[in-house]
Each structure stands twice: as C-alpha cells, then as structure tokens.
C-alpha cells in the first residue's frame, strides 16, 4: 500500500487512477468502510464521515480517469488508511499526518532554550532532523531541544520528518532576541566625546521594555548604575541618569549613549541590560571604555591607558620621524628627558593601532 505523509493544517491529495481514461464510478472510504466521497451520475456525493466538510475531488480530471481525494486543513486524527474503489478494484493509501510546533513563543531571548514538539499519529515511529539557519544539525524523536539559543540561530529552521522512507518538511521561523554584538570596546583619548551604540539583532513592530547601563569603573571599588531608561514603541525615555558622568541618550533605536568626555575615572566596563515586555529574562551587551592620556611633567613624558586592555596590547611612545621608541606590554610607558618634537603614544594590537595621542615636547634651554 502507498504511504503519503501530510502536514497538520496543510492540504493533501490522495491519488486514485482508473485504467480507462474516462468518467466512471468511484468511492473513497476510510478504514472503517465509511464512505467519504464518491460519484453518483455526474455529481460528487459525500458520505457521513468526519472528513465530509474538508474532503473534495478534482472534477475536471474525472474524464481522464483521475479520481483523487483532496483533504484540506489536515488534522493528526486524519491519519488513516483510505480506500479508493474504482473499476472493481481497491487502492489503499495510508495517510500519516504530522505536526511540528515550537513549545513556546518563537521569539526567544539569547541563551533560552527552544523545544520543538512533533505531533504524530499513534503507531508511527518518525525521526526528525532539523537544520538551523547557521547550518547546525539536530536530531531527535518526538521532541527536539536546543538548550541555549545563539544569535546565529535566528531565522528559518528546516525540519524533516521521516517515516517509511518518506519525508515531509517543516519550516519554523525563530527570532532570537539579542544585541548584534555580545561585547564591544571603545578606545578614546582623554577629553574626547564617547559614543556607545547598542544595535539589536532583530526587528519587532512593537518594542517596549526598560533597561539600565551598569558600570564598573576600573578605579572604583564598586559598580553603579549610570543610566536607566524606558522603551515604549521604539521611543526611548531616560528614567534616571547619574550626575557624574552625565550621559545623554538618543530618543530612537538603536540604543545610543553619549559620554561628553572620556576621563580616566570613567574607564572600565559596563553591562547594558534590556528587559522586553512580556519576556522573562534580559538581553545583555558588554561595553568597555579604554582611555589614553599623554602628559609631560618636568623631565618625564608619560603615556597611560586605563580600562580593560588585554595583556598582549602594546603601548609605545615614539618620536615622529625619528627612531626613538619605547614599547611595553603595560598600561604606562615613559621617557625621561625626551627629545624635543612631536611624540606619538600608540596603543596597538599585533601592529594594528587602536588608539593614538600626540604630544609636543618643546625644547628646554
């Protein structure tokens, strides 16, 4: 007998062909021999089955000897063996209807788990294989679990259900609610304006929630809130801002913060958390601020950086157009009795300059 796989909510066509390409009598019945539909004269008649209001046939193909049955809005309980009686012969078709749904909302926070549940007819033993938009393959039986969703899991998941060498494909759209970046570092010279941006990795028609930037300055013994805000239909309103530093916040998305000037006492790392309406849990983005200061005091030229720097970063002081250079994998470098000229302080990572500050040393007579 032929096996046909169907998807819950979809439409399926069960085919039945007569040997002669002409209009003839036919009937479709279920396994309990209850008539579903058939032909009487030139008219389609329906029997007392539960399918009667969802079953149909292509009348236009009857004179070609094709007596298919179309079942709309498939239900799991439509799974059955259907019998087509035509020209004194019986054709059996086994229909297996499957459903695949996400156990919760398909808009999930990064780090939350996704569970896909397969609805299947009794007696079936299907296998499921899902492929994430990022190419991750996950296999399972009745349930498939993704324990910790990542940004790259956002998009259309393609799941294939297999039974009796037949397959049916499901597509499920998953939106992972996250910031575009988990972490970012801003490098600034002392006194420069600092811009922090927190773009989201998703778009929602209505975006409402609240948030906070919590900051741990390198020089401070404890962390504190720098700003709290509300978000109503993508409009940002500041709730409370600390007096020092006095941050400014953009009124529209993406979330955007401005620190009037970079100062050593502000260097450190922060965590922006965003709580979205009707979601338990929060989105997080780490942000780091590294501040550079170059100073000359008496016979000492010093360059310092504050904030979270990796030990492999190099800090150097170099005299422009001269070979004189002092380099260290440290947070401060200095030159005693520096030559007159324009000195450059450079913070670099494997030769790539992250931050530079120039300071002019005037000759002392």
């Amino acid at each position: 007998k032929k096996v046909v796989l169907g998807k819950k909510g979809d439409t399926v066509e069960l085919t039945c062909n007569a040997s002669q390409k002409k209009n003839t009598q036919f009937h479709w019945k279920n396994s309990n021999q209850i008539k579903i539909l058939g032909i009487q004269g030139l008219f389609l008649t329906k029997g007392p089955s539960k399918l009667s209001d969802r079953a149909d046939s292509r009348k236009s193909l009857w004179d070609q000897g094709c007596f298919s049955m179309i079942i709309k809005n498939l239900k799991i309980e439509d799974s059955d063996t259907y019998i087509c009686e035509v020209e004194n012969k019986k054709e059996e078709v086994e229909l297996l209807v499957f459903g695949l749904t996400a156990n919760s909302d398909t808009h999930l926070l990064e780090g939350q788990s996704l569970t896909l549940t397969l609805e299947s007819p009794p007696g079936s033993s299907p296998s499921v294989k899902c492929r994430s938009p990022g190419g991750k393959n996950i296999q399972g039986g009745r349930t498939i679990s993704v324990p910790q969703l990542e940004r790259q899991d956002s998009g259309t998941w393609t799941c294939t259900v297999s039974q009796d060498q037949k397959t049916v494909e499901f597509k499920i759209d998953i939106v992972v609610l996250a910031f575009q970046k988990a972490s970012s570092t801003v490098y600034k010279k002392e006194g420069e304006q600092v811009e922090f941006s927190f773009p989201l990795a998703f778009t929602l028609e209505k975006l409402t929630g609240s948030g906070e930037l919590w900051w741990q300055a390198e020089r401070a013994s404890s962390s504190k809130s720098w700003i709290t805000f509300d978000l109503k239909n993508k409009e940002v309103s500041v709730k409370r801002v600390t007096q020092d530093p006095k941050l400014q916040m953009g009124k529209k998305l993406p979330l955007h913060l401005t620190l009037p000037q970079a100062l050593p006492q502000y260097a450190g790392s922060g965590n922006l958390t965003l709580a979205l309406e009707a979601k338990t849990g929060k989105l997080h983005q780490e942000v780091n601020l590294v501040v550079m200061r170059a100073t000359q005091f008496q016979e000492n030229l010093t360059c310092e950086v504050w904030g979270p720097t990796s030990p492999k970063l190099t800090l150097s002081l170099k005299l422009e157009n001269k070979g004189a250079t002092v380099s260290k994998q440290a947070k401060a470098v200095w030159v005693l009795n520096p030559e007159a000229g324009m000195w450059q302080c450079l913070l670099s990572d494997s030769g790539q300059v992250l931050l530079e500050s120039n300071i002019k040393v005037v000759p002392t007579w």
Epitope: R240, T242, Q243, E277
Partner: antibody, heavy 119, light 107 residues
C-alpha cells in the same frame, strides 16, 4: 563595608517635630540616591521619600508632603528626615536605604529608628 | 499611585518545599520590580532586582520572574533561614510602593 546608621528617633507628642539622621560609610555617599522607608508596628513597608546625589531633586509620598522633608549633607555623609506636625499615623520604624542596586533597587538598609507619636 | 497586591498573605510550608509568591501591579511596570526579605526586628534585605536579577550573595534557590503586571518570587527548596516576610516593590513611578507582604511560616 557599606553601613547606614539611623539616629534621632524617640517619643514625640502629636504636632511635635523630630529630625532623623542617617550616617553613611563604606561608599561614596555623594554618588547615590537615598531613600527613607517606614514600617508602622506590625504593618508592611511604606516608601516615604528619596533624594538625588546632590540634593536638588526630591520626591515624597503624598501623605507626608509638607510635613516630612528629606535632605542630605554630602560633606558629612549624612541623610536627614525633618519631621514636623507629627501625627499618630507617623508612628513607625524609619529605615534609610541606599538606591544602589541594579534597576533602582534598595540594596543597603539601616537598622531603623523608632519614632513614636503619642500624647 | 500604583497598587501592588501580593498573594497569598501567608503561606505555611516545610523545609524542602517549593514556595511561590505572586505580586500584581495595578498597571504595567515593565521590569521595575524588586523583592525583599525581612525577618522580625531586622531591616529588609534585597533578594531580586529588575524582576529576575539575583542580588549578589543571595542563594540561587531564590528566583524571580515576570514582567508588566504579574511577577513571581520562587524559593525552590525552602531552608530554615527562609522563614520570613517577603515584599515586592515597584520602582516604575513615584511614589514607589510595596506589596502588603507575604509571611512564610513553618508548617
């Protein structure tokens, strides 16, 4: 270690005045909003007032407006609650608390000062 | 003013039990909600901030959830030191308001 110590509580007649103080230590007092919260005997907590870092922004619950006033002196690391025209319903333990927690939570509390308004 | 309603007002439980306390705000407060524990004669202690954030030093058996108007504090396995009164508090708009409290008693 963060510490908040209230003082100035006691017995006062209806219509009388009292000034509660809260001495802060173990943190940069001038960097935090501060609150007063009270608790009547056997009752729940009631937020009374709060004040911003430099003292020029203040909020009070309607039931105490014009009678209880929050203030601070950053040079002395102190928070105050000036209580005038006191009534029986003001009888409570008054706690000072730091608004230093994430999401505006009150992360440190003093041990409380009992104010009894009775004739 | 935003009214905060806690339920139940008291709960009798045994050590090891799972206890849930709910708090409902009279209007949406996003995640501006904190939970406090208070023992007799002591000051309240912050447990949860921002509806679901666990305050540093608080045991992980305490958890918070919810957003908008409905919030829950859950103690996954009640310990002897957890018998106390618990309060929710909104920091969405002034005046800040507390729930009436939920007393967790020994059964």
């Amino acid at each position: 270690e963060v510490q908040l110590v209230e003082s100035g509580g006691g017995l006062v007649q209806p219509g009388g005045s009292l000034r509660l103080s809260c001495a802060a230590s173990g943190f940069t007092f001038s960097s935090y909003w501060m609150s007063w919260v009270r608790q009547a005997p056997g009752q729940g907590l009631e937020w009374v007032a709060n004040i911003n870092e430099d003292g020029n922004e203040k909020y009070h619950v309607d039931s105490v407006k014009g009678r209880l006033t929050i203030s601070r002196d950053n040079a002395k690391n102190s928070l105050y609650l000036q209580m005038n025209s006191l009534r029986g319903v003001d009888t409570a333990v008054y706690f000072c608390a730091r608004e230093g927690g994430q999401w505006l939570a009150l992360d440190y509390w003093g041990q409380g000062a009992l104010v009894t308004v009775s004739s | 003013d935003i009214q905060m309603t806690q339920s139940p007002s008291s709960v009798s439980a045994s050590v090891g039990d799972r206890v849930s306390i709910t708090c409902r705000a009279s209007q949406g407060i996003s995640s501006w909600l904190a939970w406090y524990q208070q023992k007799p004669g002591k000051a309240p202690k912050l447990l949860i901030y921002g509806a679901s954030g666990l305050q540093s030093g608080v045991p992980s058996r305490f958890s918070g959830s919810g957003s908008g108007t409905d919030f829950t504090l859950t103690i996954s396995s009640l310990q002897p030191e957890d018998f106390a009164t618990y309060y929710c508090q909104q920091a969405n708009s002034f005046p800040w308001t507390f729930g009436q409290g939920t007393k967790v008693e020994i059964k």
